[in-house]
């Protein structure tokens, strides 16, 4: 008998090369075969459970950046007046959540912020839990 | 044929709203359906393997905080003279280990320390390994 | 019917007690039953996917340390002029990658650097993906 295989784990790596002041960061998924999807600059959560979240990036100017997942809830990450980020976190997310950026710059210029090495990774930690597709 | 499902991963999120000087933090599990259990203010480890550990909290006064798992072993986390914690770690834990806090304050007052956003998450990373229930 | 078991997750914990200036750290795997292998002071990657990486150590002198995975790619970790490291990261690694150290000291002495608590952990986060053995 063939040993059971793991169904694919819900995970995604998105990249971002620019962020818009008072808005968010433009995220793209470089791989076609990710198990999670991007929609309207947000990562769509289909499965309940803990997620490992990794956020990296180097910004062309000082900014304040937050990563949200649900209206009315506090951010997953919140960084104030930084030019880079390299953070890891764990959070419980659920079906219908959407992970998205909010960015504010402190310059009078309202130009886009350029980003090098901008990367956001989400990896589901509770396969076997509830999922809705 | 139905594809195999994942058995539930051993994981738990506990909350703590106060810590006792020279003792530990009072932990409660908000969810009934956690796959790990709390006993005597300790999280009980039933499965051998690596665990992802996330610890967060904001304290009402400066304290030193350690998170232990086994008598005679060094702490999983150790923070000296802090008013907040937001740390992630990986550690190998085994059946019979118990994860618990030790706290020391620097004030002459021996009052309890209040905690906002106190959260400890453990997520097993090696399903398929040895477990004893 | 017996519920399906998880096949073992690709993971490894290696230890290192010394590092050689201008070279790397001498890594050994204390456990015989690791699911990943060490070869020529490198950890061999057989499975594509995200990896959770934990790096810890206390060094007998100040050094700069990088952890690489592929020629011509930037490091997974890079620390400058430190006497200790306690870092966690997430990275996408693939079949044929090799994870290894590079170390530089700032002393005129070219002696080995002693390490206490030197530990590198890799845990695959995408079981079910491509593996080559």
């Amino acid at each position: 008998q063939v040993p059971p295989q793991y169904p694919p784990i819900q995970s995604i790596r998105v990249q971002f090369t620019r962020c818009e002041n008072e808005k968010g960061c433009i995220i793209t998924s470089p791989s076609k075969d990710e198990t999670m999807k991007v929609q309207d600059n947000s990562i769509i959560i289909n499965c309940d459970g803990f997620y490992l979240i990794s956020l990296k990036g180097y910004f062309s100017e000082e900014l304040s950046l937050s990563l949200y997942y649900r209206k009315g809830r506090g951010p997953l990450f919140s960084l104030s007046k930084v030019t880079s980020v390299d953070s890891i976190g764990v959070a419980y997310l659920a079906f219908k959540d959407k992970v998205y950026f909010n960015v504010t710059t402190h310059s009078t210029s309202y130009k886009d912020i350029q980003v090098n090495g901008g990367e956001l990774i989400l990896i589901h930690q509770n396969p076997g839990g509830f999922c809705a597709y | 044929q139905v594809p195999p499902q994942y058995p539930p991963i051993q994981s738990i999120r506990v909350q703590f709203t106060r810590c006792e000087n020279e003792k530990g933090c009072i932990i409660t599990s908000p969810s009934k359906d956690e796959t790990m259990k709390v006993q005597d203010n300790s999280i009980i480890i039933n499965c051998d393997g690596f665990y992802l550990i996330s610890l967060k909290g904001y304290f009402s006064e400066e304290l030193s905080l350690s998170l232990y798992y086994r008598k005679g072993r060094g702490p999983l986390f150790s923070l000296s003279k802090v008013t907040s914690v937001d740390s992630i770690g990986v550690a190998y834990l085994a059946f019979k280990d118990k994860v618990y806090f030790n706290v020391t304050t620097h004030s002459t007052s021996y009052k309890d320390i209040q905690v906002n956003g106190g959260e400890l998450i453990l997520i097993h990373q090696n399903p398929g390994g040895f477990c004893a229930y | 019917q017996v519920p399906p078991q998880y096949p073992p997750i690709q993971s490894i914990r290696v230890q290192f007690t010394r590092c050689e200036n201008e070279k790397g750290c001498i890594i050994t795997s204390p456990s015989k039953d690791e699911t990943m292998k060490v070869q020529d002071n490198s950890i061999i990657i057989n499975c594509d996917g995200f990896y959770l990486i934990s790096l810890k150590g206390y060094f007998s002198e100040e050094l700069s340390l990088s952890l690489y995975y592929r020629k011509g790619r930037g490091p997974l970790f890079s620390l400058s002029k430190v006497t200790s490291v306690d870092s966690i990261g997430v990275a996408y690694l693939a079949f044929k990658d090799k994870v290894y150290f590079n170390v530089t000291t700032h002393s005129t002495s070219y002696k080995d650097i002693q390490v206490n608590g030197g530990e590198l952990i890799l845990i695959h986060q995408n079981p079910g993906g491509f593996c080559a053995y």
Epitope: - | - | S60, E61, S84, S107, K111, Q114, G117
Partner: antibody, heavy 120, light 106 residues
Framework: EVHLVESGGDLVKPEGSLRLSCVVS????????MNWVRQAPGKGLQWVAF????????TYTDAVKSRFTISRDNAKNTLYLQMSSLRTEDTAIYFC?????????????WGQGTLVTVSS | SYVLTQLPSKNVTLKQPAHITCGGD??????VHWYQQKLGQAPVLIIY???SRPTGIPERFSGANSGNTATLTISGALAEDEADYYC?????????FGGGTHLTVL
Amino acid sequence: EVHLVESGGDLVKPEGSLRLSCVVSGFTFSNYVMNWVRQAPGKGLQWVAFISGDGRSTTYTDAVKSRFTISRDNAKNTLYLQMSSLRTEDTAIYFCAKEKYSSGWSFEYWGQGTLVTVSS
Amino acid sequence: SYVLTQLPSKNVTLKQPAHITCGGDNIGSKSVHWYQQKLGQAPVLIIYYDSSRPTGIPERFSGANSGNTATLTISGALAEDEADYYCQVWDSSASVFGGGTHLTVL
């Protein structure tokens, strides 16, 4: 000025237990590796145990492994050595020692020592 | 485990050079530290990293290390240098001391 003061030494019976303390001042305790070193009467120095600044890494000489535990309370600027299952050969003066930063874990400052006597 | 070998005792004439040796397998690849301990006192670090002197240690103390031998040299021994001298290295996460050399200044 750096000071290290050991205490807790005593006369104890074989298989007994004892906890030594070392209170330090004059430096930021949590930034430094600490060690215990012992010296049996009329004999040389023997390293006993190492602990990192944050207390997360500990190592021991083979002779005391699983019997002794080194720990520290950075809030109290205090280093500890919990000794159990004591043997007559553990009789010695016990010194705590602070590392010299980034100098190969050389022992820059020592306390005056505390005497532990194990005898029936 | 790693072993450091020192001669138990050594005599030196006042104001003459004294050489105290510490032997170990390929000790030249390790960093050696030296301590002086006078009767009834705690040890004092006198040389670290083979040849570096901490602040306050007289210039007459120097160190060298190569091959299988590390050497502590006192260029002109004084009466106050009469003491026990210990070498120390780290190996495989453990510290090792030599057995010590008692220096008598004649």
